[in-house]
């Protein structure tokens, strides 16, 4: 059962795995619900009861029955990982405490204008975990204004004490608001010869780099397939760093892989989520329970339904036996891996699917798309929304893309005579106007949040957010697309698509159904000499063919250019402006996503 | 109707600098660009450059880009071309023009020209 | 920068006869080439753009053809009132820029 709520002076007895030390009882809640085996959390705050050397300590809990004694205890906050609850989880943690100084490795100091500019400077250092900042108030003259960078094995404080006129806080990486380049690549025939922080048992070398990512102290990887010749190493993912932050050394080894970190695209593809099944394979682990299952799809259920289970491994029926139901085998580990992988028995294994709502809930796959033709199919473009006005009768005024469960993102310029936020209705997991009937349900828009630099489409910083007053429950017809990864601003999109309901040629009239239209992206300086009197910034991207033809058209303002990069759909662009519908050679114009993702998540995150 | 009037012909010393008006009626003047376009006696058709005037963006031809300066007045609906540091090539007439689109293309009313001789 | 370059510089041709225009790009230029018509001491005139299409007002015996970078204008029978300077422009790249013009002239 999911249990939000803070329990005060109360402290769970036992159970304990290990103690961090964290700045408070809701970060606790948070390493707890990322640690592998965390269900419960106790913390002692400051308080002139408690033992100084106490406080700020978080005692990382495990019970089999889910549950331990409570005992009161002043100054203790205990609670429940957020693991049995079926909501988004964020390890994203933008708060700053002041007075508190973290503990860690000081491996850069320098002088910072301001707390922000630290934590700033933090988030786009690749060793960076957390940081200490000194204020101009700080009584020692030569520490005033310094920013300490940190770091430790646990990506949390070694120890956390009370210290006047300093602030400290984290690396904002877990919120995708990292400069740091985000390299998707995975080498083969690759090993990369630095010191290993740790190592772990996985499956292929997609999990290998899934878990270098989550772990705190992993740059890059190195995995051995099970074809690599040395067979105590089979499936042995070799988690590593370095000084520099780069692999110093790349030796060439058939059957071997290596890769990088994805913290800095983690907003954009799934890190936690290890979906796939592995046949003829077996994952070894302390074994939790021994359920009948008819398939290894309900194996991964059960396992993903009991809040322990970390991976399984199920075996078929022999034949007319047990009502052809086979084995289920429900495990855990103590780092989440399996303890060893084994081939060639007729097993299939997999992981919980529990870690997945820890991604973002744009990252998770979507059916597949229908190849050709113009009209789109029902749940095709699961976070394409028609924006309606009813001022002065009703109409489909804009396309829009959701983004959160609260969030629409389009452009500025739908906005132009919108006196009022009551006069608009959202409609998602549409495919024809036609569906759109007196009682259909839409969420209605609570507030307008249109960029304060935007004069006109043409000028740029034509994006617009609406928040809706009601959230979005996600199905298969209506889900969010990722927003592009800073770090991913070098990546060349090939798969890129331009949706909406508009016109598909000048003075034509809406389209009733979703209409899609593939387009490739033009480069802004060939884009630039097709548009002489107006300029292209990087803060627009350029798509359409060179023969025209397919455009997007008036009435498709707003909407997504999605394109699709390593199997998740990002919103690269919104429809902005450009020259009539798919006029040969003029491409589309529209706003470049990436250049305003940190505008989206201070509009969208803020308190 | 649509109508471009340009000023009158000038003549102008080498080394100094002369500025062309061009007064737009008969459309809304910030929806379409503004290009400027000149005629050597006797050559043919050089591009100098381009106005945006709802946006006051200008992109200028590389012969020109050091020399020319292109600028508008919207209360009045006139664009203005302005080229510095004369010499006696740059005799031409010089014509305005508005794009037939709103983003670029054909040139579809053009101004009757000014005639700029550069003579010591 | 793209070059224009037409072809002939000069052409006579009798009254009701068809005059025809050479244009070739040094690239493609896809559609976005216009013809104009200039008459001695006035502005060039906008005949034809997008290659094909006639403007506004402009007699049905003058036509556009062509495709990537050979357009061609055609009088499909030649008036008094032809006599001009004809002149290609493409559109497709910045800077804009014009062939050298073809007179045309009554035989």
């Known amino acids: 059962e999911c249990v939000t709520q803070l329990l005060k002076d109360t402290c769970f007895e036992g159970g304990d795995i290990t103690t961090v030390f964290t700045p408070s009882a809701k970060y606790c809640q948070v390493v707890c619900t990322y640690h592998p085996r965390c269900l419960l959390f106790t913390f002692t705050a400051e308080s002139p009861s408690e033992d100084p050397t106490r406080w700020f300590t978080c005692v990382l809990k495990d019970s089999v029955t889910e549950t331990l004694p409570r005992v009161n205890r002043t100054a203790a906050i205990s609670g429940y990982s957020f693991k049995q609850c079926s909501h988004q989880i964020s390890a994203c943690n933008k708060d700053i405490y002041v007075d508190l100084d973290m503990k860690g490795i000081n491996y850069n100091s320098s002088v910072a204008k301001s707390a922000q500019e630290c934590q700033e400077r933090c988030t786009d250092d690749v060793h960076c975990h957390f940081f200490t900042y000194a204020t101009r108030q700080f009584p020692s003259l030569e520490h005033r204004n310094i920013c300490l960078l940190k770091h430790t094995q646990t990506g949390t404080p070694t120890r956390i004490t009370k210290l006047d006129k300093v602030v400290s806080g984290f690396s904002l990486k877990s919120c995708a608001l990292s400069n740091l380049a985000c390299i998707r690549d995975i080498f083969p025939n690759t090993v990369f010869a630095d010191s290993n922080i740790d190592s772990v048992m996985a499956p292929d070398a997609f999990v290998c780099g899934r878990i270098c990512t989550h772990h705190p102290g992993c740059l890059f990887f190195t995995f051995f397939s099970q074809e690599w010749p040395k067979e105590s190493q089979r499936n042995l993912c070799l988690l590593k760093t370095s000084e520099s932050g780069l692999p110093s050394t790349r030796i060439k080894k058939s059957k071997a892989l290596s890769g990088f970190s994805l913290q800095s695209c983690r907003h954009s593809i799934p890190v936690f989520c290890h979906s796939s099944f592995y046949h003829d394979t077996d994952f070894l682990g302390e074994e939790l329970d021994i359920v009948a299952a008819k398939s290894h799809e309900a194996c991964q259920k059960l396992c993903t339904n009991a809040v322990r289970c970390q991976f399984f491994t199920y075996t078929p029926a022999q034949a007319s036996c047990n009502e052809g139901k086979g084995k289920c085998y429900l495990k855990l580990s103590s780092n989440g891996s399996p303890t060893k992988i084994l081939h060639g028995r007729g097993g299939i294994s997999g992981y919980t699917l529990r870690l997945c709502k820890m991604d973002n809930e744009c990252t998770t796959k979507i059916k597949p798309r229908i190849v050709g033709g113009t009209a789109s199919v029902r749940g095709e473009w699961p976070w394409q929304v028609t924006l309606h006005t009813t001022s002065p009768t009703q109409r489909h005024l804009c396309g829009g893309s959701i983004i959160g469960n609260q969030w629409i993102l389009t452009a500025a310029h739908c906005f132009y005579g919108v006196e009022s936020p009551k006069i608009l209705r959202v409609y998602s997991g549409i495919l024809n106007q036609s569906e759109i009937k007196e009682d259909t349900s839409f969420f209605g828009v609570q507030e307008i949040i249109i960029h304060d630099q935007y004069k006109m489409a043409e000028s740029g910083y034509d994006i617009a957010l609406l928040k809706l007053e009601t959230t979005v429950n996600y199905t298969d017809s209506q889900r969010p697309i990722c927003l592009p990864s800073k770090g991913d601003r070098n990546v060349i999109y090939t798969d890129c698509w331009v949706t909406g309901w508009g016109y598909r040629k000048l003075r034509d009239k809406i389209q009733n159904t979703l209409q899609k239209a593939k387009i490739p992206l033009v480069t802004n300086e060939e884009c630039q000499k097709r548009y002489r009197g107006h300029k292209i910034t990087h803060k627009m991207i350029c798509a359409g063919y060179r023969e025209g033809g397919k455009d997007a058209c008036k009435g498709d303002s707003g909407g997504p250019l999605s394109c699709k990069h390593n199997e998740v759909w990002h919103l690269v662009g919104i429809t902005s402006w450009g020259e009539g519908c798919a006029q040969r050679e003029r491409p589309g114009v529209y706003t470049n996503v990436v250049e305003y993702v940190d505008w989206i998540l201070e509009k969208t995150q803020a308190v | 109707q649509v109508q471009l009037v340009q000023s009158g012909a000038e003549v102008k010393k080498p080394g100094a600098s002369v500025k062309v008006s061009c007064k737009a009626s008969?459309?809304?003047?910030?929806?379409?660009?503004i290009e400027w376009v000149r005629q050597a006696p006797g050559q043919g058709l050089e591009w100098m450059g381009v106005?945006?005037?709802?946006?006051?963006?200008?992109n200028y031809n590389e012969n020109f880009k050091d020399r020319v300066t292109m600028t508008r007045d919207t209360s009045i609906s006139t664009a203005y071309m302005e080229l510095s540091r004369l010499r006696s090539d740059d005799t031409a007439v010089y014509y305005c023009a508005r794009t037939y689109g709103k983003y670029g293309g054909a040139m579809d009313f053009w101004g009757q020209g000014t005639t700029v001789t550069v003579s010591s | 920068d793209i070059v224009m370059t037409q072809s002939p510089d000069s052409l006579a041709v009798s009254l009701g006869e068809r005059a025809t225009i050479n244009c070739k790009a040094s690239q493609s230029v896809s559609n976005d080439v216009a013809w104009y018509q200039q008459k001695p001491g006035q502005p060039p005139k906008l005949l034809i753009y997008y290659i094909s299409n006639r403007y506004t007002g402009v007699p049905d015996r003058f036509s556009g053809s062509g495709s990537g970078t050979d357009f061609t204008l055609t009088i499909s029978s030649l008036q008094a009132e032809d006599v001009a300077v004809y002149y290609c422009q493409q559109d497709y790249s910045s800077p804009p820029t014009f062939g050298g013009g073809t007179k045309l002239e009554i035989k």
């Open positions: 008969g459309y809304t003047f910030t929806n379409y660009l």
């Open positions: 106005i945006n005037p709802g946006s006051g963006y200008t």
